[in-house]
């Protein structure tokens, strides 16, 4: 039951994540105008990753697309390619996670195959996160170094009295957005790696094991404990050993040829 | 059709102060901003202050201290307030609707003579 | 505050004569967001409110004939009338209207030879 809600926790706290990646990415507010002290402004303007709009004091808005790709910042490029690609890996995962998850019944889908899906969409929205979080970070930076450098050109001097005034950029709604969304993403991964671990059958689940001595004598099989996963071939609670440890219950088999050395 | 006409006293004594109103018809003070300007006899255009559609006031900083603008949706008017005249206040006084977009001033009134003298 | 400078004071023209104005600003008018100049050019005559010609440095308002035409970027501006007519001769004011508070130049004044 907790394992349910793990799962399914991390899953619409992924999807919660992940609209917002894709919010974030498609918004025009990634920077904005500081305002210093002009709180009105005749002209407002702000951008985002695909295009630039000004506002004015009358409310009209104006936006226009970066018709090129050469003439970017390659920072912006990259930014822009870590968003895509937390979106893509975000909907791989959610794509994933959808037949992963435990009240969903798919055919006569093993709970072995649930935990491998659930486990690497897990994995897949912890880089989706990371990469929304990295792509916003490195634009939030890009934001801080420009602002200072236009803050100490803040007038620059065009012979004698004409003057230009650099405008400077801070953070956009777009940033918090990604960031939350990063982060909300990235915690769904957590939980959904966590619901693995309940989610992959109990392969150590041993009853008490007596041994027997042999005339002959045993080797144990290699590869005899295995890591409970759930990436393994044992769907079922099978030995593990087919040597001389025999559980108490158990009817004394005869040793097989592959028990001898 | 779009109108603005301002009504004011015509006549204000040196330190008094000075109200003019300024009723618009045909569009609405919440779709669209309205400034103030002024001209002084022989004198160019001076812009005073502006009231968006948003309900933000601008106004110019030299004069701040001494005006304010308010606005009566219902009556469709804007009320200009300016204290402390003097006689280099004397103007023609002008309400000019905010251009949807381009920061213009697309529509004007005819003006209101105001002069201050004692 | 931003200041604008016009040039000339005034201008004495025949009917038919191409005339231009011009009028600088102490800071650049240019927006790169949408690459538009926040300049915007008047027309007053004598006992009538001022007329909207230009806006955005070079976009004739509707109505405003096109011999005016107006040009420029940054911080240097042009007004031009092809073809001076009677109708014309009155005082051009550009203004800034990038920066508030929104600042007028002292006008350029066409008057009959």
């Known amino acids: 039951m907790a394992v349910t809600a793990c799962q399914g926790l991390g899953f619409v706290v992924s999807l919660i994540g992940i609209a917002g990646i894709i919010a974030a990415t498609c918004m025009d507010q990634w920077s904005t105008q500081d305002l210093y002290n002009n709180p009105v402004t005749a002209v407002f303007n702000y951008q985002g990753l695909w295009r630039s709009c000004v506002r004015e004091s009358s409310g009209f808005t104006e936006c226009r697309g970066y018709f090129t790709l050469l003439g970017l910042p390659a920072m912006l490029q990259a930014v822009r390619a870590l968003m895509i690609v937390g979106i893509v890996l975000g909907a791989i995962g959610l794509l994933v996670s959808i037949f992963a998850l435990k009240c969903i019944r798919i055919g006569s889908m093993e709970d072995s195959a649930k935990a491998n899906m659930t486990l690497t969409s897990g994995i897949m929205f912890i880089v989706s996160g990371l990469c929304a979080i990295a792509g916003v970070s490195v634009f939030a930076n890009m934001l801080v170094t420009n602002f200072w450098m236009s803050t100490a050109n803040m007038y620059t001097g065009m012979g004698g009295m004409v003057q230009t005034v650099q405008t400077r950029y801070t953070f956009g709604a777009a940033l918090f957005v990604g960031w939350v969304a990063g982060g909300l993403t990235l915690i769904g991964g957590v939980m959904m790696c966590i619901a693995c671990r309940g989610l992959a059958p109990e392969e150590t689940n041993y009853k008490a094991v007596s041994y027997h001595a042999s005339g002959h004598s045993v080797a144990y099989k290699p590869g005899g404990f295995k890591a409970s996963t759930g990436f393994g071939s044992n769907t079922k609670n099978k030995k593990i050993y087919d040597g001389g440890a025999r559980t108490e219950d158990e009817v004394q088999s005869y040793p097989s040829k592959h028990d001898y050395v | 059709q779009v109108q603005l006409k301002e009504s004011g006293p015509g006549l204000v004594a040196p330190s008094q102060s000075l109200s003019i109103t300024c009723t618009i018809s045909g569009f609405s003070l919440n779709t669209y901003g309205v400034h103030w300007v002024r001209q002084p006899p022989g004198k160019g255009l001076e812009w005073l202050v502006v009231?968006?559609?948003?309900?933000?006031?601008v106004y110019n900083s030299s004069l701040k201290s001494r005006l304010s603008l308010t606005k009566d949706n219902s009556k469709s008017q804007l009320l200009l307030k300016m204290n402390s005249l003097q006689t280099d206040d004397t103007a023609i006084y002008y309400c000019a609707r905010h251009k949807a977009y381009g920061n213009a001033m697309d529509y004007w009134g005819q003006g209101t003579s105001v002069t201050v003298s004692s | 505050d931003i200041v604008m400078t016009q040039s000339p004071s005034s201008l004495t023209v025949t009917a038919g004569e191409k005339v231009t104005m011009t009028c600088k600003s102490s800071q650049s008018l240019f927006n790169s967001g949408n690459q538009r100049n926040y300049l915007t050019w008047y027309q007053r005559k004598p006992g009538q409110p001022p007329k909207l010609l230009i806006y955005?440095?070079?976009t004739r308002e509707s109505g405003v004939p096109d011999r005016f035409t107006g040009s420029g970027s940054g911080t240097y501006f042009t007004l031009t009338v092809s073809s001076v007519q009677a109708e014309d001769l009155a005082v051009y004011y550009c203004q800034n209207a990038y920066y508030f508070p929104f600042t007028f130049g002292s006008g350029t004044k066409l008057e009959k030879k």
């Open positions: 009231m968006l559609s948003d309900g933000n006031t």
């Open positions: 955005w440095a070079s």
